[in-house]
């Protein structure tokens, strides 16, 4: 089942997704798509990275974190009710069927009518799967498809739900995470 995140109309939504490069510079292509993760790739791609840069995006979608260190969390600017739905974060690890897929459900709430201090993000988040993997390969920079195949070993799964929006800063520790190397 998908992990749920919430945001209000007019605010920015934040969908966490992380991986740990096997070695500095061993970046892995990532795609974000609207809709559940299909067997391959991402459907309705909204943003994509290669082994170095963001190489495709649509308006209002960006990576605000340090994506070259594995923080590929998606920010959606100025959300509307139409942004509700499932989003797929896919870590495209080289090798047959090695990709890691994370489905995140975004629920958009109507904006509060009563005046209140503006909050940048207001959502309820649950811990997505935490995953650790083991890999192999030299420490030198290898990119653009030169990474070796990586054997994945799933370690743990869904944990307790976070309800306090003040814990948004802790999402680095609770986001969809894959560790390579």
């Amino acid at each position: 089942s998908e992990v749920e995140y919430r945001a209000e109309v007019g605010q920015n939504a934040y969908l966490p997704c992380f991986y740990t490069p096997a070695a500095p510079g061993n970046l892995v292509p990532v795609c974000w798509g609207k809709g559940a993760c299909p067997v391959f790739e991402c459907g309705n791609v909204v943003l994509r990275t290669d082994e170095r840069d963001v190489n495709y995006w649509t308006s209002r979608y960006w990576l605000n974190g340090d994506f070259r260190k594995g923080d590929v969390s998606l920010t959606i600017e100025n959300v509307t009710l139409a942004d509700s739905g499932i989003y797929c974060c896919r870590i495209q690890i080289p090798g047959i069927m090695n990709d890691e897929k994370f489905n995140l459900k975004l629920v958009i709430k109507p904006a509060k009518v009563t005046p209140a201090p503006t909050r940048q993000r207001d959502f309820t988040a649950a811990f997505p799967r935490m995953l650790t993997t083991r890999g192999h390969g030299p420490a030198e920079t290898q990119t653009l498809g030169s990474l070796p195949d990586i054997n994945l070993t799933q370690i743990s799964t869904l944990a307790n739900e976070l309800r306090d929006s003040r814990l948004a800063n802790d999402l680095r520790d609770s986001g969809a995470t894959i560790r390579i190397g």
Partner: antibody, heavy 120, light 107 residues
């Protein structure tokens, strides 16, 4: 010390091609990307693309796609940038520049530049 | 493509005074902005990367700040050798793009 030494100035006619070389020394050639940037006379900087010598992977600016090809010769630690179907507005100084993960793929060492003049 | 817009185009500053150059991205680029210095007849030199990281050997009078869409290069006390053209670059997406340049001169 790191050095990038480029080939000499070129004068070409419209429609012709030019191939600029960039010989690297002082670092492991395959550990870094090689970017190419150009600067028209009195103008700003324009990124053409990059090549990763480790495996030959490339990324080109769409503006030049189909006209530009970047290659490397690992045995001589040399990068090449070929631009075809030259036009007068391709007149510029062409730079090669090294980029790597440590500086978030910004360009920390640059060649001296190669002046390409396109004139009939 | 992401458009980088620098201001001002030209900046006269007295020696010893502070110089501030701004760069605005057409969309958020996180912290992925670099600053380069270019003197006539020379290739650019990297000063700052990832918005605020000073490159090796760059004097500490140069500093960078900002995130998202708005970025600033500050020279705390202008020296004669700082006269040059300064460019911002976004290194977030492909194609990488540069600002149009700011010419820093002595007032």
């Amino acid at each position: 010390q790191v050095q990038l030494v480029q080939s000499g100035a070129e004068v070409k006619k419209p429609g012709a091609s030019v191939k600029v070389s960039c010989k690297a020394s002082g670092y492991t050639f395959t550990d870094y990307y090689m970017d190419w940037v150009r600067q028209a006379p009195g103008q700003g900087l324009e990124w053409l693309g990059y090549i990763y010598p480790n495996n030959g992977g490339t990324s080109y600016n769409q503006k030049f796609k189909g006209r530009v090809t970047m290659t490397t010769d690992k045995s001589t630690s040399t990068a090449y940038m070929e631009l075809r179907s030259l036009r007068s507005d391709d007149t510029a100084v062409y730079y090669c520049a090294r980029s790597g993960y440590g500086n978030y793929y910004t360009m920390d060492y640059w060649g001296q530049g190669t002046t390409v003049t396109v004139s009939s | 493509d992401i458009v980088m817009t620098q201001s001002p185009d030209s900046l006269p500053v007295s020696l010893g005074e502070r110089a501030t150059i701004n760069c605005k991205a057409s969309q958020s680029v996180g912290n992925n902005v670099a600053w380069y210095q270019q003197k006539p007849g020379q290739p650019p030199k990297l000063l700052i990367y990832y918005a605020s990281n000073r490159y090796t050997g760059v004097p500490d009078r140069f500093s960078g700040s900002g995130s998202g869409t708005d970025f600033t290069l500050t020279i705390s006390s202008l020296q004669a050798e700082d006269v040059a053209v300064y460019y911002c670059q976004q290194h977030y997406s492909s194609p990488s793009t540069f600002g149009q340049g700011t010419k820093l001169e002595i007032k």
